[in-house]
């Protein structure tokens, strides 16, 4: 799985077990969602390409007091090579587009599933 995603590699590439755990966590979030996730908090949309893990963390780290995504935030920090703090933004953010956390998680989940499949069947 060293070249997961080819040229759009979301580097650094997490090992398949770690990626699988992140996907499982996102699945749990989407399945267990009763009330609006994180009270309907809005986050910056991101480009799901290279550097995606750091960008996702930069976006989600600005959501505070939402226990549902705390584990996801921790897992993403393990995939991002640099320290991320609130208010930090990379070029991967679509700065004019904000979406609900629930939609952000769904989009991220779909993309990670695709990356996982690509890694398995290479």
């Amino acid at each position: 799985l060293t070249c997961l995603g080819g040229f759009a590699s979301p580097g650094p590439v997490p090992p398949s077990t770690a990626l699988r755990e992140l996907i499982e966590e996102l699945v749990n979030i989407t399945q267990n969602q009763k009330a609006p996730l994180c009270n309907g908090s809005m986050v910056w949309s991101i480009n799901l390409t290279a550097g995606m893990y750091c960008a996702a963390l930069e976006s989600l780290i600005n959501v505070s007091g939402c226990s549902a995504i705390e584990k996801t935030q921790r897992m993403l920090s393990g995939f991002c090579p640099h320290k991320v703090s609130a208010g930090q933004f990379s070029s991967l953010h679509v700065r004019d587009t904000k979406i609900e956390v629930a939609q952000f998680v769904k989009d991220l989940l779909l993309h990670l599933k695709k990356l996982f499949r690509e890694g398995q069947f290479n």
């Epitope: 699988r20 599933k113 695709k114 499949r117 690509e118 398995q120 069947f121 290479n122």
Partner: antibody, heavy 120, light 107 residues
Framework: EVQLVQSGAEVKKPGATVKISCKAS????????MHWVKQAPGKGLEWIGG????????ASNQKFKGKATLTADKSTSTAYMELSSLRSEDTAVYYC?????FGGGPFAYWGQGTLVTVSS | DIQMTQSPSSLSASVGDRVTITCKAS??????LSWFQQKPGKAPKSLIY???RLVDGVPSRFSGSGSGTDFTLTISSLQPEDFATYYC?????????FGGGTKVEIK
């Protein structure tokens, strides 16, 4: 409703090649991996291999390397398995099976099976 | 390759009985295990995935448990339509491997 519809039974001579199809409907074809499973008469289930329909990337059981070739046509939502150099031990029912690895498992949905008989 | 050892290979039971089938993996499979039911001349049907999650539409008398290398399929109260052959499958890593099957027959 997810459906996997396989092509009909085949009778082939030893040494021949057969190509089985599996047409998927009820979901986005490229969202789930597609696998193929062999069941010889009176025997258990054996994984042949799988394909990611989005990329065409494959994974296969070493036992079937050189025997089974897996392909997928996104335009028709159809997966194919070609079996070459057929021998009597290739006589079996072959199933295609698909699903969401994380939501039901990769073998959640099954085709009805295609019986391939190899006989001279 | 990961070996899946299923036991027993066959069993006889009566309607209403509690039935337990086990599957042992040759290494830790991280609970990436499914159970299937197959009736003669039919395709297998998925019952359980991820070791303990019931597939939509499957009766609640079916349950899965276990972790690591040891897994169990339980039918709490056997019904006439449950007489069939059951298989486990590990999908933790390629090549995916099935157990040898357990035929549940009428006593």
């Amino acid at each position: 409703e997810v459906q996997l519809v396989q092509s009909g039974a085949e009778v082939k001579k030893p040494g021949a090649t057969v190509k089985i199809s599996c047409k998927a409907s009820g979901y986005t074809f490229t969202d789930y991996e597609m696998h193929w499973v062999k069941q010889a008469p009176g025997k258990g289930l054996e994984w042949i291999g799988g394909i990611d329909p989005e990329t065409g990337g494959t994974a296969s059981n070493q036992k079937f390397k050189g025997k089974a070739t897996l392909t997928a046509d996104k335009s028709t939502s159809t997966a194919y398995m070609e079996l070459s150099s057929l021998r009597s031990e290739d006589t079996a029912v072959y199933y295609c099976t698909s699903g969401d690895y994380f939501g039901g498992g990769p073998f959640a949905y099954w085709g009805q099976g295609t019986l391939v008989t190899v006989s001279s | 390759d990961i070996q899946m050892t299923q036991s027993p290979s066959s069993l006889s039971a009566s309607v209403g009985d509690r039935v337990t089938i086990t599957c042992k993996a040759s290494q830790d499979i991280n609970s990436y295990l499914s159970w299937f039911q197959q009736k003669p001349g039919k395709a297998p049907k998925s019952l359980i995935y991820r070791a303990n999650r019931l597939v939509d539409g499957v009766p609640s008398r079916f349950s899965g448990s276990g972790s690591g290398t040891d897994f169990t399929l339980t039918i709490s109260s056997l019904q006439p339509e449950d007489f069939a052959t059951y298989y486990c499958l590990q999908y933790d890593e390629f090549p995916y491997t099935f157990g040898g099957g357990t035929k549940v027959e009428i006593k």
